[in-house]
Interface confidence: low
């Protein structure tokens, strides 16, 4: 076995927006890390049989397998997968080692399967069997967090309950507004699940694996605030935990804080007080108020007064499933050309929402804001001016929702002509929807100003695949009009287009545009 | 549903007093507190006082000695005494009970 060639099997993942995939399967962009699929030889198989270890790989995601051979001279190779011969082109890398590669675009049911490998070299024939299957993300979850208070301590735990095990992290920001956005400089992450500060502005958890990411956002009463015009609202489920942090500065110490619901005191046990002094010797408390698992009646305002500030209050709703509320009637929009212009939705939701803006059968990322009266609001304003129809979806664990709008462009009609032996057709997708007039050219009309009414049929505005409106209208030819130019016009309150017929016998039809 | 509406405000002389009151419908009065917060031209809603549920009140410190709050549950209704006034006093009286607002009523402090 000494004739044997050293050989390395790797697996190369491409991330899902790399360009550098390439088309062909012999020359693939290296993108990632090449993972070692090891490549032992089978034992008690008939030749030499080697086996990559087993590949799995995400629906949509785009990968390479990768053979590379340390054989002396020239090696020839085949690819063969579910009984079909495909194309192999061995190259040599800078190590001289022969280099096979099969690359698989955005992974399908279909592509998953057995893939052989037949590699002869100089010395001697062999196989390599790779098997790749569709990773069964069916099992795979990823919950929102959610908090515990850590056993005789003062610190809170986040848990997500996660297939497989999440990367938790702590997202903390002790600036107020915008600039506690991710990705601003204000905002620090902790990888871990235990938090011990808990004193900051904003606290939220995240938990994040090859589903996406999750967040949660400790509910928090700030008492040195103004208080919204709006009540702030606190949708749980019911069995859900529910944690409100109350949060007070004072000058000294001499300040007590109290949570009520519906003005009864919580009871022991459902609250704990932690408090610190800032850098400017100030007394910082915050006063946590929890439920371990909420009921219906947990339902109702949650008071948090302070011997020295003004009271604040926090409507906590239980349901018994999520909702997305939102009016779903469609809305239909006109703009100009270039006027700026965003489609909007604004909805109440819980859990929070996943949704995507979709248009020409594309679809676009969907991002949402939070209102300060507790609605959401997403908007979309990438639309380029193209006219049609734009949908927006939503969806949590409990509810879906779908709202259409349509956006037209006003613009001038533009006029495309076509004829055959027994009528000329002109089309046009201006907005507002045009007009139409025919007119026919003569000696007697060289202006082609004389109008022509009979045997013109104008249909109704008909809708194309994605909402776009379009025009027409049809001229019957008759005896009276054969051999002359005729004009159709489109008009609407934006302008005039032309197009202007030959109406010869049967064969070719020039046409002049007339603008 | 609660609705609040506050009554009293006028054009006063600095020196002067006033007293603000407001009237809430529905049954959830004596058990809320009842906040006062005002708002001068241009300038941010500031609070001004509370009144607890049992009768305990809380002020803006600059403010205290020269404002009272009270309260009378059998009347629905949260009043505001303000003496000495000053011409920084000027501003529109809101009162607000969990997150139901009054319309407002102006107070003008003018010699």
């Known amino acids: 076995n000494q004739d044997l060639p050293v050989i390395k099997c790797v697996l190369i993942n491409h991330k899902n927006n790399d360009s550098s995939v390439g088309k062909s399967s012999s020359y693939p962009m290296v993108s990632e890390s090449p993972e070692d699929l090891g490549c032992a030889l089978r034992p008690q198989s008939s030749g030499t049989v080697y086996e990559a270890a087993a590949v799995e790989v995400d629906v949509s995601a785009s990968i390479t397998l990768q053979v590379l051979v340390d054989a002396p001279g020239n090696i020839s190779c085949l690819w063969v997968f579910k009984h079909s011969s495909l194309n192999c082109q061995p190259h040599f890398d800078l190590q001289n080692r022969g280099v096979v590669s099969m690359v698989i675009l955005k992974m399908t049911e279909t592509q998953a399967g057995e893939y052989l490998l037949f590699i002869q070299s100089e010395a001697t024939n062999y196989t390599i069997l790779f098997t790749v299957s569709i990773r069964n993300t069916l099992l795979y979850t990823l919950r929102r967090p959610y908090f515990r208070k850590m056993e005789n301590q003062d610190a809170l735990v986040c848990i997500s309950e996660s297939v497989p095990e999440p990367i938790v992290e702590w997202v903390l920001c002790d600036s107020q507004g915008e600039s506690c956005k991710e990705e601003s400089p204000a905002v620090v992450k902790k990888e871990e699940k235990v938090l011990h500060e808990l004193f900051g502005t904003d606290i939220r958890c995240c938990a994040r694996n090859e589903l996406g990411r999750e967040c949660t956002r400790l509910f928090t009463i700030d008492l040195n605030q103004t208080p919204q015009t709006t009540l702030p609202q606190l949708f749980l489920k019911v069995g859900e935990p529910l944690w409100i942090r109350c949060k007070a500065v004072h000058v000294n110490h001499g300040f007590g804080l109290t949570w009520e619901l519906e003005n009864k005191a919580l009871e022991e046990g459902n609250y704990f007080e932690m408090s610190t002094y800032s850098t400017n010797r100030t007394m910082i408390r915050i006063l946590f108020a929890f439920v371990s698992s909420v009921a219906r009646n947990d339902t109702g305002y949650y008071t948090c007064s302070s011997s020295k500030h003004p009271s604040q209050s926090a409507l906590v709703t239980i349901v018994e499933k999520g909702f997305i509320n939102a009016t779903n009637s469609s809305e239909d929009y006109e703009i100009d050309q270039y006027e700026e212009f965003c489609f909007s939705v604004r909805f109440k939701a819980y859990p929070q929402i996943r949704c995507t803006w979709t248009f020409s059968r594309k679809s676009f990322p969907c991002e949402q804001k939070g209102l300060d009266n507790g609605y959401s609001i997403s908007k979309f304003c990438n639309h380029k001016h193209q006219p049609g129809e734009y949908i927006f979806h939503a969806e949590n664990d409990d509810a879906q929702f779908t709202k259409m709008f349509t956006l037209n462009i006003r613009r001038k009609p533009q006029v495309l002509a076509e004829a055959s032996a027994s009528q000329a057709s002109c089309f046009s997708d201006g907005y507002p929807l045009p007009s139409w007039t025919w007119k026919k050219c003569s000696d007697k009309s060289p202006n082609c100003t004389e109008e022509i009414t009979e045997g013109v049929w104008n249909r109704k505005a008909n809708r194309k695949v994605f909402g776009q409106w379009v025009s027409s209208s049809t001229l019957n030819m008759s005896e009276a009009i054969k051999g002359f130019l005729v004009k159709c016009c489109a008009y609407n309150s934006l302008g005039t287009s032309c197009e202007t017929i030959l109406l010869n016998s049967p064969g070719p039809f020039p046409f002049i545009q007339d603008n | 549903q609660v609705q609040l509406q506050e009554s009293g405000g006028g054009l006063v002389q600095p020196g002067g007093s006033l007293t603000l009151s407001c009237a809430a419908s529905?049954?959830?009065?004596?058990?809320?507190?009842i906040d006062w917060y005002r708002q001068a031209p241009g300038k941010q809603r500031e609070w001004v006082a509370q009144?607890?549920?049992?009768?305990?009140?809380h002020y803006e410190p600059s403010l205290k000695g020269r404002f009272t709050i009270s309260r009378d549950n059998a009347k629905n209704t949260a009043y505001l005494q303000m003496n000495s006034l000053k011409p920084e006093d000027t501003a529109v009286y809101y009162c607000?009970?969990?997150?139901?607002w009054g319309q407002g009523t102006q107070v003008t402090v003018s010699s």
């Open positions: 009144i607890t549920s049992g009768g305990n009140t």
């Open positions: 529905g049954s959830t009065f004596s058990r809320n507190y």
């Open positions: 607000r009970i969990l997150d139901y």
